[in-house]
């Protein structure tokens, strides 16, 4: 089971939507559904995501990047990994940087994994810059 | 197939050159050739790279870090992963930070993987700080 | 062999201590002992760590994040991966960011792996923000 999803510039809402077919994207043994990766087989997975944030005029608004898990058995989302950026650039100038997350988790069949970010308009969705993936160990 | 290449302070040009033998470096089932990792066996690979940038006096020049793929069948390089940093430090002071990239790609026998960066003089090549690797899933 | 250890807010000293049981933490085929992961079986491992730094008033004190290895056969610790941050925020304001490290290493039975950081008081130990793990390839 493996997936590498790449940035989709048509993302209009949270959680982020992804490209699962073209370019460097690939998916096998898991399903892609409405922004989420759906686990088919219970086991240990390495999960990763990178988001490339940039803006024309820095005002240091908080940047959040989360990978979270949802399962119909549990009422609340479980945040697996997250990053927050505060006070990262000089006001008034263009700015750019990425957030990277990656770790091992025990996932169960039917778990849905998503990526949440704080500001859609600040993301560059090029496939090499923003992505989300996993593979079964 | 696995490799972990470490920073080579004798790098004089782009793409970066690497240490493949001493210290924590290791290589097996792939070849190292003129800065590149050459894939022997088609399949899925997790590819990663970290670059440690630092400078004596910040002027916020753009920092680029790319992992790209070259194959004789294709005329152009394919950028697999990249990071750009702009507006990341207070002008005139010493500064330091790293860029980390890592993801899964479907690679083909004879693909060459390289790391490109924007400013050789701003890299610290210590083996624990700057590296490039992959392993076959 | 696999482990994912999460932030332990009761860490009072260096190396960092971790949670190995509750929440998203997991461990199998390696041992957790006084902040360290103890390798049972010689082989290749992907090792990773993320540390989330934050502070109430930026003074740009250096931030270090290291993954190092200790073995009774060697007198000195071996730093496998490290990150240093200097000049990363505007003085006097709240700030936050993470450091991520991950790479492949050839580890030997009885090797101990630890995480070292520069300033305990600047870390947020939530399980999704600060973690340390590995898995055998």
């Amino acid at each position: 089971s493996v997936a590498h999803l790449t940035g989709n510039p048509h993302s209009r809402s949270i959680p982020l939507e992804w490209e699962d077919t073209y370019g460097t994207a690939l998916i096998s043994g898991v399903k892609y559904k409405k922004g989420g990766l759906v686990i088919n087989e219970t086991g240990l997975y390495f999960v990763y995501s990178k988001v490339y944030f940039r803006g024309q005029s820095c005002n240091n608004q908080p940047l959040n990047h989360k990978v979270y898990m949802r399962n119909s058995k549990y009422p609340e989302d479980l945040v697996l990994m997250e990053e927050k950026r505060l006070n990262y650039c000089t006001t008034g100038q263009i700015w750019a940087h990425s957030s990277y997350l990656g770790a091992v988790f025990n996932l169960t069949s039917a778990d849905h994994l998503y990526v949440n970010i704080s500001q859609l308009s600040l993301i560059n969705f090029e496939e090499s810059k923003t992505f989300f993936g996993l593979y079964k160990l | 197939s696995v490799a972990h290449l470490t920073g080579n302070p004798h790098s004089r040009s782009i793409p970066l050159e690497w240490e493949d033998t001493y210290g924590t470096a290791l290589i097996s089932g792939v070849k190292y050739k003129k800065g590149g990792l050459v894939i022997n066996e088609t399949g899925l690979y997790f590819v990663y790279s970290k670059v440690y940038f630092r400078g004596q006096s910040c002027n916020n020049q753009p920092l680029n870090h790319k992992v790209y793929m070259r194959n004789s069948k294709y005329p152009e390089d394919l950028v697999l992963m990249e990071e750009k940093r702009l507006n990341y430090c207070t002008t005139g002071q010493i500064w330091a930070h790293s860029s980390y990239l890592g993801a899964v790609f479907n690679l083909t026998s004879a693909d060459h993987l390289y790391v490109n960066i924007s400013q050789l003089s701003l890299i610290n090549f210590e083996e624990s700080k700057t590296f490039f690797g992959l392993y076959k899933l | 062999s696999v482990a994912h250890l999460t932030g332990n807010p009761h860490s009072r000293s260096i190396p960092l201590e971790w949670e190995d049981t509750y929440g998203t933490a997991l461990i199998s085929g390696v041992k957790y002992k006084k902040g360290g992961l103890v390798i049972n079986e010689t082989g290749l491992y992907f090792v990773y760590s993320k540390v989330y730094f934050r502070g109430q008033s930026c003074n740009n004190q250096p931030l270090n994040h290291k993954v190092y290895m200790r073995n009774s056969k060697y007198p000195e610790d071996l730093v496998l991966m490290e990150e240093k941050r200097l000049n990363y925020c505007t003085t006097g304001q709240i700030w936050a960011h993470s450091s991520y490290l991950g790479a492949v290493f050839n580890l030997t039975s009885a090797d101990h792996l630890y995480v070292n950081i520069s300033q305990l008081s600047l870390i947020n130990f939530e399980e999704s923000k600060t973690f340390f793990g590995l898995y055998k390839l």
């Epitope: 940039r54 024309q56 005029s57 005002n59 006001t91 008034g92 100038q93 263009i94 750019a96 560059n124 090029e126 | 916020n60 753009p62 750009k84 702009l86 507006n87 | -």
Partner: antibody, heavy 119, light 106 residues
Framework: QVQLVESGGGVVQPGRSLRLSCAAS????????IHWVRQAPGKGLEWVAV????????FYADSVKGRFTISRDNSKNTLYLQMNSLRAEDTAVYYC????????????WGQGTLVTVSS | DIQMTQSPSTLSASVGDRVTITCRAS??????LAWYQQKPGKAPKFLIY???SLESGVPSRFSGSGSGTEFTLTISSLQPDDFATYYC????????FGQGTRLEIK
């Protein structure tokens, strides 16, 4: 010396398209962000769009988003503005302007090119 | 969006006068403000950045001050070449210009 020269303006009907160009000389074009700023007849200045030094990122004013596309060819030292679905309110003199070291202010401006959208 | 309001809209003055143009921001923009001069049929000319830093080559009779929401452009002794329209521009959050102040001969 730094020079920016716009061209491509003219009279066009509503709903039609036009492409403006801005030829740059006297500086290293590929290291500067370049903006388009417009000025309706007898009115003030309005920022339109920007493209980063390497062309990697572009930003637009809400009034033109989805209709205008900024691009550049660093090998030709040229900036472009593709204007589609033009409206009467797009009538203006269009200036290209160089930003100062990644700051959003403009140290050099072209002489402008007039775009008139009229039926 | 941050709105920039200049006052007065028109200012009549004579050669040798000291004149002040005010620019107000709808919210704090720290010192991230630039000033430009524009003459009829010409492109704007860059004068001041970061509220008070004079661009190289701009005569020292021009000065800027202010921070937060209130800013001023002062010309200490008007010269014939100074009669023009002046614009402020904030770059704290994207880019917006004031509506302009026309400085005319009294």
């Amino acid at each position: 010396q730094v020079q920016l020269v716009e061209s491509g303006g003219g009279v066009v009907q509503p709903g039609r398209s036009l492409r403006l160009s801005c030829a740059a000389s006297g500086f290293t074009f590929s290291t500067y962000g370049i903006h388009w700023v417009r000025q309706a007849p007898g009115k003030g200045l309005e920022w339109v769009a920007v493209i980063w030094y390497d062309g990697s990122d572009k930003f637009y004013a809400d009034s033109v988003k989805g209709r205008f596309t900024i691009s550049r060819d660093n090998s030709k030292n040229t900036l472009y503005l593709q204007m589609n679905s033009l409206r009467a309110e797009d009538t203006a003199v269009y200036y290209c302007a160089r930003d100062r070291d990644n700051w959003n202010y403009f140290d050099y401006w072209g002489q402008g090119t007039l775009v008139t959208v009229s039926s | 969006d941050i709105q920039m309001t200049q006052s007065p809209s028109t200012l009549s003055a004579s050669v040798g006068d000291r004149v002040t143009i005010t620019c107000r921001a709808s919210q704090s923009i720290s010192s991230w403000l630039a000033w430009y001069q524009q003459k009829p049929g010409k492109a704007p000319k860059f004068l001041i950045y970061q509220a008070s830093s004079l661009e190289s080559g701009v005569p020292s009779r021009f000065s800027g001050s202010g921070s937060g929401t209130e800013f001023t452009l002062t010309i200490s002794s008007l010269q014939p070449d100074d009669f023009a329209t002046y614009y402020c521009q904030q770059y704290n959050s994207y880019i917006t210009f004031g509506q302009g102040t026309r400085l005319e001969i009294k």
